[in-house]
């Protein structure tokens, strides 16, 4: 019995269906086929869980969190014992193993390993201003998403004709900050932060209005 090489790793967007491949060759009939799918979750590497089991011509549920979401892609028994996981969750990220036994065929490699990473688009970020908006001050524009796998990068833009930040601005696309030094009335305007990762983007808006000093009456 020989389980075919797996692609190594699979990436899927949260909520979509993942197909975990596992095929094998055997010299024996599939009368005594026994297939166990296991996962070692990334979030809890010390706690392997059963995903689904095929034994004695019957299918059995694995861990409760997979109930109703997991099944074999084809009619069993078969030499293609790939499984699907519907409505993938972040907690489904981990290393999956298919363990195949088909007596009396013994020997050879009977385990296939596939990594699954569930990707999450950035949630809409939170935009805020840190610092005084008085003319001549320094301000920091802050942008961060609560969710996003891989970790989002952040791009600030000023929504004028150029989409360019003021010349006194410095941007950190990893932290999501823009520091604008010595703000002037020209700094005023609507700013948009775009949070991006491999599978999506999201945005937030911030209206920065620089406050000019009021003329003082000299009596």
């Amino acid at each position: 019995l020989e389980v075919s090489e797996s692609p190594g790793s699979i990436q899927v967007a949260r909520g979509q269906t993942a197909v975990l491949p596992c095929t094998f060759t055997t010299s024996a009939a599939l009368i005594n086929l026994n297939v166990i799918w296991m996962v070692t979750p990334l979030s809890n590497a010390n706690q392997p869980e059963q995903v689904i089991l095929y034994q004695g011509g019957q299918m059995f549920d694995g861990a409760p969190r997979f109930h109703g979401r997991v099944g074999f892609t084809g009619t069993m028994p078969a030499t293609n014992v790939s499984v699907f996981i519907n409505n993938t969750q972040l907690s489904d990220t981990g290393t999956y193993q298919c363990l195949v036994n088909n007596l009396p065929d013994i020997g050879g490699r009977n385990i296939g390993v596939t990594g699954l990473t569930v990707l999450v688009p950035p949630s809409a970020p939170h935009c805020q201003i840190q610092g005084s908006q008085d003319i001549g001050s320094d301000v920091i524009l802050l942008c961060s998403s609560e969710e996003g796998i891989p970790r989002p990068t952040y791009l600030w833009e000023k929504l004028d004709n150029t989409l360019k930040l003021p010349p006194t601005a410095t941007q950190d696309q990893v932290q999501g900050t823009v520091t604008i030094r010595n703000i002037s009335t020209l700094t005023s305007g609507l700013y948009q932060c775009v949070a991006s990762n491999a599978i999506g983007t999201s945005t937030c808006l911030l209206d920065l209005q620089v406050i000019s000093p009021q003329p003082r009456n000299i009596g």
């Epitope: 009335t185 609507l190 911030l206 209005q209």
Partner: antibody
């Protein structure tokens, strides 16, 4: 009480121009960004343009960019929309709307009653 | 641009009914969502801002919920004055965009 009163709507030929005005009262006009939103007959709402409280920053929907100009006169508490090169698809009721300030930019909390602009030959 | 999709486009209901309107954004918009009511020949009126906050003066039978991409406007017990068209609107990104509207009619 916040009030927004429009004027300037009417019938205009394709390629023509029109200027809408919106007189504001009941709040400190210069403290609020203002916007224009339109609604074609029997259709939904479409944001057209916005302007900051000071008037220094203006924003437009792609559909009107280069043809429409938003402006304001804070001494007169009045918002304007200059519409040039008008097209049949600009036919709509035009509303001026006050926008919440700061981090709530983009929320229209008070609206005018609307003025109808008809572009037809 | 962020697309906003409302469902249903119209519904018929009776006074006293509980009515639910949904709005879906084409990308996550967090809670940057507003709901408006518009009666025929009238200007829109802000009902709910920030997805779930009731605008001052709006009856408590109106409520909003949701975050991310899926949002709901609920009228707990429909009153005669509630027959109107309802619009959702996102303020997460530019340009500001509205849903196509949901018309609530008398059954």
């Amino acid at each position: 009480e916040v009030q927004l009163l429009e004027s300037g709507g009417g019938l205009v030929q394709p390629g023509g121009s029109l200027r809408l005005s919106c007189a504001a009262s009941g709040f400190t006009f210069s403290s609020y960004a203002m916007s224009w939103v339109r609604q074609a007959p029997g259709k939904g709402l479409e944001w057209v343009s916005a302007i900051s409280g000071s008037g220094g920053s203006t924003y437009y929907a792609d559909s009107v960019k280069g043809r429409f100009t938003i402006s304001r006169d804070n001494s007169k508490n009045t918002l304007y929309l200059q519409m040039n090169s008008l097209r049949a698809e600009d036919t709509a009721a035009y509303y001026c709307a006050r926008m919440a300030a700061g981090a709530s930019w983009g929320t229209f909390d008070y609206w005018s009653q609307g003025t109808l602009v008809t572009v037809s030959s | 641009d962020i697309q906003m999709t409302q469902s249903p486009s119209s519904l018929s209901a009776s006074v006293g009914d509980r009515v639910t309107i949904t709005c879906r954004a084409s990308q996550s918009i967090s809670s940057y969502l507003n709901w408006y009511q518009q009666k025929p020949g009238k200007a829109p009126k802000l009902l709910i801002y920030a997805a779930s906050s009731l605008q001052s003066g709006v009856p408590s039978r109106f409520s909003g919920s949701g975050s991310g991409t899926d949002f709901t406007l609920t009228i707990s017990s429909l009153q005669p004055e509630d027959f109107a068209t309802y619009y959702c609107q996102q303020r997460s990104g530019s340009p500001l965009t509205f849903g196509q509207g949901t018309k609530v009619e008398i059954k």
